[in-house]
Interface confidence: medium
C-alpha cells in the first residue's frame, strides 16, 4: 500500500475538499461539451485529504451531511482517499482564495468487463481543473457493492445512498498534472509533468505520450511490460520514476516548433485508464535590426525583425529630435512575411526617414509574447547637407 | 554547408580603391542573411565595415564616411567590397562574413591588403 | 559608437584552472556575443546571444551578463583553449569588438 506523506516543515493535516460539479447524466454524449440540459448540478467531498497547513486551515471544519440543502439539491459524492494520493490538494482547497476556479465533471466510468462484474459496483470519474494553467486532476470512484436492501436508493443514479444522502465512493486511480499549458524557447528542454497514484492491488500496465496538433496525432513516447519507447528523437521519460515515485513525466530536449501542440498522457492500470491533455507552446523571441536602404534626400529606414515564433508582433517607430523626445511615427509599411525551415517568422517594417534640420534618431521597437520587454534598434539619420 | 571566399589584389597604391570580391557557395545571398566586410588591423583589432543584406539593403560604419560601397550580383552570389582613397592605415586582413541571425557565423578566411607605393 | 573594453588583456591559466573574462560596453546591450580567434585564422563563432554555445563548443565554455556587463568563463582550463576572444555587439550600430583577451597556457 501506498504511504501518506510524512509531516514536513508545517503540518499534515486531514481536510474535507468540497467541490462543486456537474454529473453528466447517462446517455449524455461523453467527449463532448454537454449541454445544460445532459447536465446535472453535482457536489464532490473528498473526505480526510491530507494537505499541509501553512496556518491557513484553522477555520476549516469538516463536511457535514445535511448542509446543503436547497431547493434543487445536488447529488453529492463522497470519495474516500485513502487508497491513494491526492498530491495537489493544496491547489483545489486555497483556488477560490488565490482567484482561481475549478471546474469539475463527473461521469459514470465504464469498465471493459463482464456484466456480472459490472453489476457489483459502479464507477465514476471525475475531471478537476484549476484554471490559470494550474492542476488538472483526473479521478476514478468506486461505489461500494451495490445491494438493493438499502434503506435510500437514488432513483436516477440507480444506487444506494448514505443515511446522509450521499453517494459514497473510494478513489482508486488517480493521473493528475501540475501544469495544463506550458511554454518554453526554441532550442530549449522541456519537462512535460504526469503523475499518478494507484490503489494496492493494481497494476501499471502502460504509458502513453500522444501529441495531437492541427487534426494529426502521433505517438511521442510509450513504456509498456518494462519496456519504454521513444518516437520523438530524445525523448525520456524514467522507468524508475514510474515505479517508485508514479511519475511518468515525459522530458523532450532540443524543442523545435513540431513540438508544439497537445499533449495526451495516459496511464493504464489493470483495471482503469485516465489521462491528463498538457498544451505546450513553443516561442523564440525575435531578433531587429535597423538599417538605411539609401542616402537620397528622403533615406528609408529597414527594420528586419527575424527568427520569432509564434506570429502575433507588433512593431512601432519612434523619432527623437535632438534635445526632444520621442514621438511615434506613422506610415510604415512591411513587407511580405517569410517563414523559415526551423519554422520561425521574419518581416520588414519600412519607413521614409525625415531627419529635419539637425538630424534624428529613430528607434523600430518590436514587441512580442516571448520578450519579457520590447526590443529596439536605434539608428541616426542626418540631414543631407550633414553627410560627408 | 555555407562557404565564403575572398578574393582581390594583395597591394593597392595610397588614394586608389580597395576592390574586393566575396564568393558564397552553399547558400543564396537573396535568400536570407546578411553578408559583411569586416577587417582585422596589424594589431588584431577587429572593425566591422558594413553588409548587404539578402533584400539589398546596405549600413557602413559611419567611420568609413562616404569611401565604401558594398553590392552584390546574385546571378554570380557574390558581394563586393569598395573602399576608395585608402591610405597605408588600411593596411589589414579583409574578412568576408555572413550571419543567420546569429552574428557572423560563416567567415572567409581572409585576405591581406597592404597599402603601399 | 558602443566602444567594448575587454579585461584583462592578455591572462594566462594552467590546465584544469577556472577562467574569466569580461567585457564591459559603453552603452547596454540586449545580447553579448563571443568569437575565439587562433593565430592565422578566421574569428569563429563561440558563445551568441549572451549565453548559447555555438556548435562544436566544449560545454566547459558559458557566458553570462546583462545590459553593460558580460564575461565568458572556461571552468576547466584546457591547451585548446589557447587563443584570443573577442566580444561583439550586435544591438546597435555600428557594430563594434572588443579589443580582444589573448588565452595563453602555462
Known amino acids: 500500500a501506498e504511504t501518506k506523506p510524512h509531516p514536513a516543515e508545517g503540518q499534515w493535516r486531514a481536510v474535507d475538499v468540497v467541490l462543486d460539479c456537474f454529473l453528466a447524466k447517462d446517455g449524455a454524449h461523453r467527449g463532448a461539451l454537454a449541454s445544460s440540459e445532459d447536465r446535472a448540478r453535482a457536489s464532490l467531498v473528498l473526505k480526510q485529504v491530507p494537505v499541509l497547513d501553512d496556518g491557513s486551515l484553522e477555520d476549516f471544519t469538516d463536511f457535514q451531511g445535511g448542509t446543503l440543502a436547497q431547493d434543487d439539491p445536488p447529488i453529492i459524492f463522497e470519495a474516500s482517499v485513502d487508497l491513494v494520493q491526492i498530491p495537489q490538494a493544496e491547489a483545489l482547497l486555497h483556488a477560490d482564495c488565490s482567484g482561481k476556479e475549478v471546474t469539475c465533471e463527473i461521469s459514470r466510468y465504464f469498465l471493459q468487463m463482464t456484466e456480472t462484474t459490472v453489476k457489483t459496483a459502479a464507477w465514476f470519474m471525475a475531471n478537476m481543473q484549476v484554471s490559470g494553467g494550474g492542476p488538472s486532476i483526473s479521478l476514478v470512484m468506486k461505489t461500494p457493492r451495490v445491494t438493493k436492501n438499502e434503506a435510500l436508493w437514488h432513483p436516477t443514479l440507480n444506487l444506494p445512498l448514505s443515511p446522509q444522502g450521499t453517494v459514497r465512493t473510494a478513489v482508486e486511480f488517480q493521473v493528475m498534472t501540475q501544469t495544463q499549458s506550458l511554454s518554453f524557447l526554441l532550442g530549449s528542454s522541456a519537462s512535460l509533468d504526469c503523475g499518478f497514484s494507484m490503489a494496492p492491488g493494481l497494476d501499471l500496465i502502460s504509458v502513453e505520450w500522444r501529441l495531437q496538433h492541427k487534426g494529426r496525432g502521433q505517438l511521442v513516447y510509450s513504456w509498456t511490460a518494462g519496456q519504454g519507447q521513444a518516437v520523438r528523437k530524445g525523448a525520456t521519460l524514467e522507468p524508475a520514476q514510474l515505479g517508485m515515485a508514479r511519475d511518468a513525466s515525459l522530458t523532450l530536449p532540443g524543442l523545435t516548433i513540431q513540438d508544439e501542440g497537445t499533449y495526451i498522457c495516459q496511464i493504464t492500470t489493470s483495471l482503469y485508464r485516465a489521462q491528463q491533455i498538457i498544451q505546450l507552446n513553443i516561442q523564440a523571441s525575435p531578433k531587429v535590426r535597423l538599417s538605411l536602404a539609401n542616402e537620397a534626400l528622403l533615406p528609408t529606414l529597414i527594420c528586419d525583425i527575424a527568427g520569432y515564433y509564434p506570429l502575433d508582433v507588433v512593431v512601432t517607430w519612434t523619432r527623437e529630435e535632438l534635445g526632444g523626445s520621442p514621438a511615434q511615427v506613422s506610415g510604415a509599411s512591411f513587407s511580405s512575411l517569410r517563414q523559415s525551415v526551423a519554422g520561425t517568422y521574419s518581416i520588414s517594417s519600412s519607413l521614409t526617414a525625415e531627419p529635419g534640420s539637425a538630424g534624428a534618431t529613430y528607434t523600430c521597437q518590436v514587441t512580442h509574447i516571448s520578450l519579457e520587454e520590447p526590443l529596439g534598434a536605434s539608428t541616426q539619420v542626418v540631414p543631407p547637407e550633414r553627410r560627408t | 554547408d555555407v562557404q565564403l571566399q575572398e578574393s582581390g589584389p594583395g597591394l593597392v597604391k595610397p588614394s586608389q580603391t580597395l576592390s574586393l570580391t566575396c564568393s558564397v557557395t552553399g547558400y543564396s545571398l537573396t535568400s536570407g542573411y546578411f553578408w559583411h566586410w569586416i577587417r582585422q588591423f596589424p594589431g588584431n583589432k577587429l572593425e566591422w565595415m558594413g553588409y548587404?543584406?539578402?533584400?539589398?539593403?546596405?549600413n557602413y560604419n559611419p567611420s568609413l564616411k562616404n569611401r565604401i560601397s558594398i553590392t552584390h550580383d546574385s546571378s554570380k552570389n557574390q558581394f563586393f567590397l569598395n573602399l576608395n582613397s585608402v591610405t597605408a592605415e588600411d593596411t589589414a586582413t579583409y574578412f568576408c562574413a555572413g550571419d543567420d541571425w546569429d552574428w557572423f557565423a560563416y567567415w572567409g578566411q581572409g585576405t591581406l591588403v597592404t597599402v603601399s607605393a | 559608437e558602443n566602444v567594448l573594453t575587454q579585461s584583462p588583456a592578455i591572462m594566462s591559466a594552467s590546465p584544469g584552472e577556472k577562467v574569466t573574462m569580461t567585457c564591459s560596453a559603453s552603452s547596454s546591450v540586449n545580447y553579448m556575443h563571443w568569437y575565439q580567434q587562433k593565430s592565422s585564422t578566421s574569428p569563429k563563432l563561440w558563445i551568441y546571444d549572451t549565453s548559447k554555445l555555438a556548435s562544436g563548443v566544449p560545454g566547459r565554455f558559458s557566458g553570462s551578463g546583462s545590459g553593460n556587463s558580460y564575461s565568458l568563463t572556461i571552468s576547466s582550463m584546457e591547451a585548446e583553449d589557447v587563443a584570443t576572444y573577442y566580444c561583439?555587439?550586435?544591438?546597435?550600430?555600428?557594430?563594434?569588438f572588443g579589443s580582444g583577451t589573448k588565452l595563453e597556457i602555462k
Open positions: 548587404i543584406s539578402y533584400s539589398g539593403t546596405t
Open positions: 561583439f555587439q550586435g544591438s546597435g550600430y555600428p557594430l563594434t
